[in-house]
């Protein structure tokens, strides 16, 4: 008789999740010599220990603490790039501008990027059928708690000028309910962070509006200013040209506004 299994509203654990995490860890430590001392089997064991045999609606930041310890890493605090709803461009940027880091450029972010995972209370099984949805089921699920934990700590680590890439094509360019709006903004440390600089990425080629005047950007400016952090904003009218100019800053076409 098949055992009754809780049906959640979200997709199940990514197939081959253990193998994927382990393989990503090995790849990351090979690419980043400063992380070659990391024992990837221990990393997987700590990751697994955070959610296996636990109710997937009752996960805490403390559950991930053993994994956090193993993911200790040097990140230049003044080279942090946050992003909201525009992950691909942010990652393309840091692949070119190698001295800047998104969360997914760190070991822990790299391990979990685009993956889903959850377990079941009192069994050692991974649930490949379904996992809790943040809205429909519960917010304290393994994936949401992981990203809230690492996002908070990433923001806390930031200093000097922090950059954030925002999607100018969205109805809410700044969304208070995004990870950036609900976690990272509120965990920037005013004694360490001087300025938050927003880069608003335009979608349409003929879009010449000043999206820095958007009401949601003004809302972000207000939140940041109240936290005693300065705010600045730049329109990136041509993201394709922006990336090209990061690659080739000497190009004559890169002196004009992008």
């Amino acid at each position: 008789v098949p055992r009754w299994r809780q049906q959640w509203s979200g997709p199940g654990t990514t197939k081959r999740f253990p193998e994927t995490v382990l393989a990503r860890c090995v790849k990351y430590t090979e690419i980043h010599p400063e992380m070659r001392h990391v024992d990837c089997q221990s990393v997987w064991d700590a990751f697994k220990g955070a959610f296996i045999s636990k109710h997937p609606c009752n996960i805490t930041e403390e559950d991930y603490q053993p994994l956090m310890k193993l993911g200790t890493q040097t990140v230049p605090c003044n080279k942090i790039l946050l992003w909201s709803r525009i992950k691909d461009l942010a990652h393309q940027f840091t692949q070119v501008q190698r001295d800047m880091f998104t969360l997914e450029d760190t070991l822990l972010g790299y391990l979990a990027d685009d993956l889903t995972w959850c377990g079941e209370f009192n069994t050692s099984k991974i649930n490949y059928q379904s996992c809790p949805d943040w809205r429909k089921d519960c917010s304290n699920n393994p994936v949401s708690v992981f990203w809230k934990t690492v996002s908070r700590r990433f923001a806390e680590a930031a200093c000097d000028v922090v950059h954030v890439m925002l999607n100018g094509s969205r109805s809410k360019i700044f969304d208070k309910n995004s990870t950036f709006g609900s976690v990272e903004v509120h965990n920037l440390q005013p004694e360490k962070v001087q300025t938050l600089e927003a880069w608003v990425i335009h979608g349409g080629r003929e879009d010449s509006r000043d999206l820095c005047q958007d009401p949601t950007i003004k809302e972000l400016e207000s939140i940041i200013s109240k936290r005693n952090i300065q705010f600045s904003c730049k329109n990136i009218y041509r993201p394709d040209k922006f990336l090209q100019c990061v690659k080739n800053p000497e190009d004559s076409s890169c002196t004009s506004e992008i």
Epitope: M68, K69, G71, T72, Q73, T74, V75, P76, C77, N78, T106, L108, V150, R153, F154, E156, A157, C159, E191, K192
Partner: nanobody, 117 residues
């Protein structure tokens, strides 16, 4: 600007003890959790121990649990690490850093601890 100055390192025999200090300035020390991290020669960064802003909560890497003790004196803006029963594998440069990690950017020069007979 966050500034820290670590001291107290040196050469010690296996089984010996050292007490590291970290003088912090440029930020409200009592508002921040703090950590000790270390880097052994040719190795990556390893988190050693952390302490809450009030000092009421502490945590340790498995490799140092029962041998190292982290503490702080908020009135002196100073973080401490008492290191007992030292082993050769504890040889490293020790840094103090604000926050609990896992992301660190050390602001000090660190203090070298060498455990050797």
């Amino acid at each position: 600007e966050v500034q820290v100055l670590e001291s107290g390192g040196g050469l010690v025999q296996p089984g010996g003890s050292l007490r590291l200090s970290c003088a912090a300035s440029g930020f409200t020390f009592s508002s921040y959790a703090m950590s000790w991290v270390r880097q052994a020669p040719g190795k990556g960064l390893e988190w050693v121990s952390g302490i809450s802003n009030s000092g009421g909560s502490t945590d340790y890497a498995d490799s140092v649990k029962g041998r190292f003790t982290i503490s702080r004196d908020n009135s002196k803006n100073t973080l401490y690490l008492q290191m007992d029963s030292l082993r050769a594998e504890d040889t490293a440069v020790y840094y103090c850093a604000d926050g609990t990690g896992p992301f660190f950017d050390y602001r000090g020069q660190g203090t070298l601890v060498t455990v050797s007979s």
